[in-house]
Interface confidence: medium
């Protein structure tokens, strides 16, 4: 997630916090988080940390569903002091919000060291299947936060440890971005509840992986249909009519445009998109808000101001994407411009660090297009040519000595306009 | 040109530890993940572990998590691998190997020289 | 985890004649996570053959790969003599990454 800074305030998923306030986090699919507290710093940064709980000093711990950690039957809250956020109901049973449970059937293709676990959010059910790790006990236990059981003293999963090899499996790689991180950064490889996380962070490429696969977290909306009339769906507060289709809008990750919902009847199905393995032509292209790639030939949708006369084409030329990210930090701006590239297949970023308008540093990376989509901040700007991308390098050149020297305030910004197309008019490419 | 340079061998004794290293040159060094595959005539090639050496994160094999530790030195370009608690089934060729890393294709595109470790008393 | 069988472990084969060698896995993996690493005597592996069928830079065209779910071929349409060595296929599906055992091809 990216957060803005500001003297008075922090952002965080588009909600402003005031300096000093604390809350749980949002993430999807599993709702409320409420192991994780997070904080608005003075500076403006969001400062989130894992609860730690303390040791529990009775027989039967009791788990409340909207508390972190387990309490002592005589240290419970009062009844009326219970979070009063929507219910879910799932198979006849009912399910408190933030609650988690374990779900059958759910999963045609559940492996058999997988299990599905389902949790209750705002109503919601959401559920994931879950790769449990190897046994290595004879006698594995029951947790109550996780489908999976475990080994005597090993329930604890953190997020501090780096240590993946349980949860992030890499079958399909496209989706394997992660979702941009706020400052507690979580590696990648333990996500919150020792679910995967829910891939798709940069909503131009990935989807939801292959279950085949058995990897990642496929997650299932349910929706708790109490209170709901006629034949409508309702998804992230829009109506559905019964047939209708819509690609669904998470709230931690934009339109996830690889995974297609339908509205049946008063329920919605979701449905993973396939890609081809395999495409009539030799480099397909991947298009903004398209899941699959697409062969030049097929028109492209348009990005502002710009015309292509077939898919990843301009005037002949053929286009790669750009991207920028600008993060602010203690009164230093890093403003990143990265072009990927599919011959070679990698991703040159440009880093330009600027203080008070002079420019503190200015380096070039050629990365793997893997670290680049483990990169948070980067959004799709623009798609350019290599002839254009040589001009802005030129001109980089140049400014980056100047502003070294002198204040620059809107030379970087007018710089990165060169990489915009204009629209082409016949006969004048 | 890409390259992966290797320490020398070790000769070491059973319970003894070993620090392996392997520094990239010819590209980004934190753009791309590092692998570490151990070679020994019994078992071919086994893969120990990555590590991301832009956030220090690393997945290991299992096998190996006891038994091997991966670390890099940004400001050298340079990847760690410590081995600990050598016993002679350690013995082996151990490489350091870059994960070429961009989507579909996920393969080791440039391997190390190989660092041969031999455990003997 | 998954395992990577890799059929024959030793073969020999003369000038110009066709080999293949098969790579056959546990479990259903994409065609994109299945590779191929050629190593000589004394030296580190090279890549040779990605995603299946992709011939890794400098590869011989006379070097091809197929396969799909659970079996993958490498195939040399004539063999030379600098195509000796051990061959080994590699999957990338999911962790553990693993190898299979190698080929050993001899020159008759």
């Known amino acids: 997630e990216q957060v803005k800074h500001s003297e008075t305030y922090c952002m965080f998923q588009d909600k402003k916090y005031r300096v000093g306030e604390r809350w749980h986090p949002y993430l999807e699919p599993y709702g409320l988080v409420y192991c994780v507290n997070c904080i608005c710093s003075e500076n403006g940064n969001v400062l989130c940390s894992r609860v730690r709980c303390p040791n529990v000093h009775c027989l039967s711990p009791v788990h409340i569903p909207h508390l972190c950690c387990p309490r002592c039957p005589d240290s419970l809250p009062p009844v009326n002091n219970k979070v009063t956020s929507k219910s879910c109901e799932y198979n006849g049973t009912t399910y408190q919000h933030g609650e988690l449970f374990v779900a059958e059937g759910l999963f045609q293709n559940r492996q058999p060291n997988q299990c599905t676990q389902c949790s209750c959010s705002e109503g919601n059910v959401y559920c994931g299947l879950k790769t449990c790790p190897k046994l290595t006990c004879a006698f594995p236990v029951s947790v109550p936060d996780s489908c999976c059981r475990v080994c005597r003293g090993d329930g604890e999963l953190s997020w501090e440890h780096s240590d993946g090899d349980i949860f992030r499996q890499p079958a399909n790689r496209e989706a394997r971005h992660s979702y941009h991180r706020s400052h507690y950064d979580p590696p990648p490889s333990r996500q919150a509840g020792g679910l995967s996380r829910f891939p798709g962070a940069r909503s131009h490429r990935g989807a939801l992986m292959d279950s085949q696969q058995a990897s990642g977290t496929i997650v299932q909306i349910v929706i708790n249909n109490k209170h709901k009339h006629g034949q409508v769906c309702v998804s992230n507060g829009k109506t559905y009519s019964h047939g209708e289709s819509w690609h669904p809008n998470l709230r931690a990750f934009g339109i996830v445009e690889c995974v297609l919902c339908t509205c049946n009847v008063t329920k919605q199905e979701c449905k993973k998109i396939h890609c081809p393995n395999r495409y009539p032509c030799k480099y397909p292209q991947k298009i903004d808000g398209k899941c699959c790639k697409v062969c030049p030939g097929k028109k492209a949708k348009e990005l502002p101001g710009q015309s292509f006369d077939n898919k990843g084409y301009f005037c002949g030329e053929e286009t790669m994407p750009v991207y920028e990210s600008v993060f602010m930090e203690d009164g230093e701006t890093t403003r990143k411009i990265a072009l990927e590239t599919e011959r070679p297949p990698q991703v040159e970023v440009h880093v330009w660090t600027i203080r008070k308008g002079i420019l503190q540093h200015f380096h070039i990376e050629k990365i793997s297009k893997r670290m680049f989509e483990e990169l948070p901040h980067f959004k799709l700007v623009t798609r350019t040519t290599l002839s254009q991308w040589k001009i802005f390098t030129e001109g980089e050149a140049q400014i980056s000595q100047m502003c070294s020297s002198r204040v620059c305030r809107t030379e970087l910004e007018d710089l990165v306009k060169v990489l915009y197309l204009e629209r082409s008019e016949k006969g004048h490419c | 040109e890409v390259q992966l340079q290797q320490s020398g061998p070790e000769l070491v004794k059973p319970g003894a530890s070993v620090k392996i290293s392997c520094k990239a040159s010819?590209?980004?060094?934190?753009?791309?993940?590092m692998n570490w595959v151990k070679q020994s005539p019994e078992k071919s090639l086994e893969w120990i572990g990555e590590?991301?050496?832009?956030?220090?994160?690393?997945t290991y094999n299992q096998k190996f998590k006891a038994k091997a530790t991966l670390t890099v030195d940004k400001s050298s370009s340079t990847a760690y691998m410590q081995l600990k608690s050598l016993t002679s089934e350690d013995s082996a060729v151990f490489y350091c190997?870059?994960?070429?890393?961009?989507?579909?294709?996920?393969?080791?595109?440039?391997w190390g020289t190989g660092t041969t470790v031999t455990v003997s008393s | 985890e998954i395992v990577l069988t890799q059929s024959p472990a030793l073969m020999a084969a003369s000038p110009g004649e066709k080999v293949t060698i098969t790579c056959s896995v546990t479990s259903n993996i994409t065609s994109s996570n299945l590779h191929w690493y050629q190593q000589k005597s004394q030296t580190s592996p090279k890549p040779w053959i990605y995603g299946t069928s992709n011939l890794a830079s400098g590869v011989p065209v006379r070097f091809s790969g197929s396969g799909s779910g659970t079996s993958y071929s490498l195939i040399i349409s004539s063999m030379e003599a600098e195509d000796a060595a051990t061959y080994y296929c590699?999957?990338?599906?999911?962790?553990?990454?693993?190898f299979g055992a190698g080929t050993k091809l001899e020159l008759k």
């Open positions: 590590i991301n050496p832009r956030t220090g994160g690393t």
């Open positions: 010819g590209y980004t060094f934190t753009g791309y993940y």
């Open positions: 190997a870059r994960d070429y890393g961009s989507s579909p294709y996920w393969y080791f595109d440039v």
């Open positions: 590699q999957q990338w599906s999911s962790y553990p990454l693993t």
